[in-house]
């Protein structure tokens, strides 16, 4: 026999937001495998810059996302399933890893704001990659993606170390509408943006964290009254 | 070795057309940016235009844009400059350079061809 | 009239040291692009000589070499050789015109 009333009701809403959260979870990973497994990109790791060093933090970043993306499809299956299937196994293990996850982001919040300037620097170093990317074979449609992204969501374009082929491509082809690379190369420069984002708007990534924090204790709340509720109605 | 061999210069006169061709031998053309840069007879360097290696990104000097087209046939391995509404100041001598990312500047070039723009 | 200024000629007897001057702008040099310099030996084409201000491609001589400050390069050649009488550009990138600039050359002559 099923749950009922209003345990029915968390039942399905815990199936929608992990089939939410399985959905961008699936979402994050394509787009991490495409940007790791492209021609393009993966014929980047043998090409020779000549004294340019050879990227490096791009694919660590890569990897980061096909881990995030993984783990975010494993979790919201869990949920999404064991909710659906009235499993108390599955919505233990849900509330398990919920748990494990909710850890490392109290881990990783303390150690971003401890290393939050190298944190930045990394992000400048994945910008600057990407953007070498984009300009050395003008075919990476994914690393083009990524630098659009950073110029779109920072509204920024190129930074003060471009080389003179960077700055002729930016100013031809990557910057936003808008933005003048010519007189305000420096005013609009990238890496002042990460680093001010990293500094003046870490509040903003704090409220993120924290939004992230509550949705979590809230799936947890929610997987324990389900299991619950399952538990009860399989004794009557 | 390297080797950048420019053709196709001659005399032409103003308003005429021009199509000048640089093949490349002993590296990957496919793979690098190309350019071409200019000499006036008893003066210095000009830079003309650039190219990206799948013909994406292109530039033009102002002096230039608007009349001069540069293209690419990387299985070819041959680089183009179609020059049309030449003016007595395009009279030169054409140099394909290619274009190093890595060295950021034109680190091998051509022997070049002359262009005489004269009626 | 260049955007990089350069002396039109420069001389020196064999085993001397001379420098070549490149004096550019904010927006070119000053902006923190690199500053590259070219042999053009009668007759021929452009070789690059250094690169990123202070390097040597493989090939050519400790003899030459490189220094920038500020919005300034420099071309130093020691021991002066009759084979080193050339024309000698700089050549950097101009964010305002957005084009590679070259200085206007200066013409090397070794004396006797």
């Known amino acids: 026999m099923g749950v009922e009333g209003c345990t029915k009701c968390i039942k399905y809403l815990l199936f929608v937001f992990n089939f939410v959260f399985w959905l961008a979870g699936g979402v994050i990973l394509g787009v991490a495998l495409w940007l790791r497994h492209d021609p393009q990109t993966t014929n980047l790791l043998y090409l020779e810059l000549g004294d340019k060093p050879a990227p490096n933090t791009f694919y660590v970043g890569i990897y980061i996302l096909i881990a995030v993306g993984a783990v975010m499809m494993f979790v919201g299956f869990l949920g999404c399933y064991g909710a659906i299937q009235e499993s108390q196994c599955l919505l233990g293990t849900f509330f398990t890893c919920l748990v494990i996850l909710f850890a490392c982001e109290v881990a990783a919040g303390i150690w971003g704001f401890v290393n939050k300037d190298q944190i930045a620097k990394d992000v400048k170093q994945f910008y600057d990659q990407a953007l070498q990317q984009a300009v050395v074979d003008d075919d990476a449609n994914n690393a083009k993606a990524v630098v659009k992204t950073f110029h779109e969501t920072l509204d920024c374009c190129g930074s003060s170390t471009l080389t003179a082929l960077t700055t002729s491509v930016l100013k031809n082809n990557a910057c936003p509408s808008g933005s003048n690379i010519i007189s305000n190369l420096f005013k609009e420069d990238c890496h002042q943006k990460i680093d001010d984002l990293f500094s003046g708007k870490l509040y903003l990534i704090g409220i993120a964290a924290i939004v992230v924090a509550v949705i979590m204790i809230f799936e947890m709340i929610l997987s324990m009254v389900l299991c619950c509720g399952i538990r009860n109605s399989s004794v009557y | 070795e390297v080797q950048l061999l420019e053709s196709g210069g001659g005399l032409v006169q103003p308003g005429g057309s021009l199509r000048l061709s640089c093949a490349a031998s002993g590296f990957t053309f496919s793979s690098n940016y190309m350019s071409w840069v200019r000499q006036a007879p008893g003066k210095g360097l000009e830079w003309v235009s650039y190219i990206s290696s799948s013909s994406t990104y292109t530039d033009y000097a102002d002096s230039v844009k608007g009349r001069f087209t540069i293209s690419r046939d990387n299985s070819k391995n041959t680089l183009y400059l179609q020059m049309n509404s030449l003016r007595a100041e395009d009279t030169a001598v054409y140099y394909c350079a290619r274009y190093s990312y890595g060295r950021d500047n034109f680190d091998y070039w051509g022997q070049g061809t002359l262009v005489t723009v004269s009626s | 009239q260049s955007v990089l200024t350069q002396p039109p000629s420069a001389s020196g007897t064999p085993g001397q040291r001379v420098t070549i001057s490149c004096t550019g702008s904010?927006?070119?040099?000053?902006?923190?692009?690199?500053t590259h310099w070219y042999q053009q030996l009668p007759g021929t084409a452009p070789k690059l000589l250094i690169y990123g201000n202070s390097n040597r491609p493989s090939g050519v001589p400790d003899r030459f070499s490189g220094s920038k400050s500020g919005t300034s390069a420099s071309l130093a050649i020691s021991g002066l050789r009759s084979e080193d009488e050339a024309d000698y550009y700089c050549?950097?990138?101009?964010?305002?015109?957005?084009?590679?600039?070259f200085g206007g050359g200066t013409k090397l002559t070794v004396l006797g």
């Open positions: 904010t927006s070119n040099i000053g902006a923190g692009y690199d």
């Open positions: 050549q950097s990138y101009d964010t305002n015109l957005s084009v590679w600039v």
